[in-house]
């Protein structure tokens, strides 16, 4: 006789799988606030910092009604990776002034990436359809000036925040309707 | 610094009318869903309504229902709430305030709406 | 009559840890997040505790919050005078579509 066969293979609870995966949020929603209000210490923000090169908001409270997993997962993992993207960037090209946010910003980018996989784990579990494979985004100019950098960094962590926010929101919203 | 500034209250007879303004400013306006709250004399507070950041979508609370209207100008920054067929009861300090989320992270100071003959 | 219940009032020492309580039911606490707000003497309120109990920034984490199925409670160690105010607890309620508090309760540091 051949090998005893394996243990049966549980299928995974969609929810516990869905708290697993707002706990990652909540934590790098937090992360990323107590980012965001030391880089306000460290260099005030005068006024509002817009990135054209970032994700458009995806939900509010008019789009919750009509949440769906798929679309929910899709695109926040979607604009997800673009945040990723823009951490490495502001990393890589910020300047000298944004050095002072590490290591605190190579943290947020390593959460960042494992809540990415949590995702992409999440939807394979729950037999979603898989994205195609994102097409090779074209480079982020590094920022004009010292100044460019900062400008920069205010949009995007500020950007990433309301999104984790809104992600929370959205997916305990899921969640009940699992 | 993100700042929330109310204005347009003051004394209105019952049944009368009111346009209250709320500006905004230190943050991105057109990307916060935008709220109305209240708060009577001496009361605890209550959610009057919410606008989407784009002005797609709103949400009232049940006693305001047909009476009360929010709207947005993104361009100017600035949110407002009309009430039409004022009653004694809608006698409060109304405020403003951002969502990000599930929560108010900024509050206006308030502006005092008295509704008397 | 709030849809969320919290006692009218509570107190402690300098010093003391106080807890407030929030009860509500599974269509606003048991499936959505609770947030509480601090309202000083005279002015609005501002946020204390979001999604149950991450501090927003710049609030001392002499507070804390926390929930289990569908109550919520707010703890505050170390009491100070300046804590004198009132606290409201909050959520999303998915019968009623709208934000839902409780009727507040007035902390006094004796």
């Known amino acids: 006789p051949g090998p005893p066969p394996g243990p049966p293979r549980v299928s995974p609870d969609p929810r516990a799988e869905l708290d697993s995966t707002v706990l990652l949020t909540r934590s790098l929603l937090a992360d990323t606030r107590q980012l965001a209000a030391q880089l306000r210490d460290k260099f005030p923000a005068d006024g509002d910092h817009n990135l054209d090169s970032l994700p458009t908001l995806a939900m509010s409270a008019g789009a919750l009604g009509a949440l769906q997993l798929p679309g929910v997962l899709t695109r926040l993992r979607a604009d997800l990776l673009s945040y990723l993207r823009h951490v490495q960037w502001l990393r890589r090209a910020g300047g000298s002034s944004l050095k002072t946010l590490e290591p605190e910003l190579g943290t947020l980018q390593a959460r960042l990436d494992r809540l990415l996989r949590r995702l992409q784990l999440l939807m394979s579990r729950l037999a979603l359809p898989q994205p195609p494979p994102d097409p090779p985004a074209p480079p982020l100019a590094p920022p004009s000036s010292a100044w460019g950098g900062i400008r920069a960094a205010h949009a995007i962590l500020g950007g990433l925040h309301l999104t984790l926010d809104w992600a929370v929101r959205g997916l305990l919203l899921l969640k009940t309707r699992l | 610094e993100v700042q929330l500034l109310e204005s347009g209250g003051g004394l209105v007879q019952p049944g009368g009318s009111l346009r209250l303004s709320c500006a905004a400013s230190?943050?991105?306006?057109?990307?916060?869903?935008m709220n109305w709250l209240r708060q009577a004399p001496g009361k605890g507070l209550e959610w009057v309504g919410v606008i989407s950041y784009d002005a797609s979508n709103k949400f009232y609370a049940d006693f305001v229902k047909g009476r009360f209207t929010i709207s947005r100008d993104n361009s100017k920054n600035t949110l407002y709430l009309q009430m039409n067929s004022l009653r004694a009861e809608d006698t409060a300090v109304y405020y403003c305030?951002?969502?990000?989320?599930?929560?108010?992270?900024?509050w206006g100071q308030g502006t005092l709406v008295t509704v008397s003959s | 009559q709030s849809v969320l219940t919290q006692p009218p009032s509570a107190s402690g020492t300098p010093g003391q840890r106080v807890t407030i309580s929030c009860s509500g039911s599974?269509?606003?606490?048991?499936?959505?997040?609770v947030n509480w707000y601090q309202q000083l003497p005279g002015t609005a309120p501002k946020l204390l505790i979001y999604y149950d109990d991450l501090l927003p920034s710049g609030v001392p984490d002499r507070f804390s919050g926390s929930k289990s199925g569908t109550s919520a409670s707010l703890a505050i160690s170390g009491l100070r005078s300046e804590d004198e105010a009132d606290y409201y607890c909050s959520a999303w309620d998915d019968s009623l579509n709208a934000v839902v508090f409780g009727g507040g309760t007035k902390l006094t540091v004796l």
């Open positions: 305030a951002r969502t990000p989320g599930s929560h108010f992270d900024y």
């Open positions: 599974s269509s606003n606490i048991g499936n959505n997040a």
């Open positions: 230190g943050f991105t306006f057109s990307h916060y869903d």
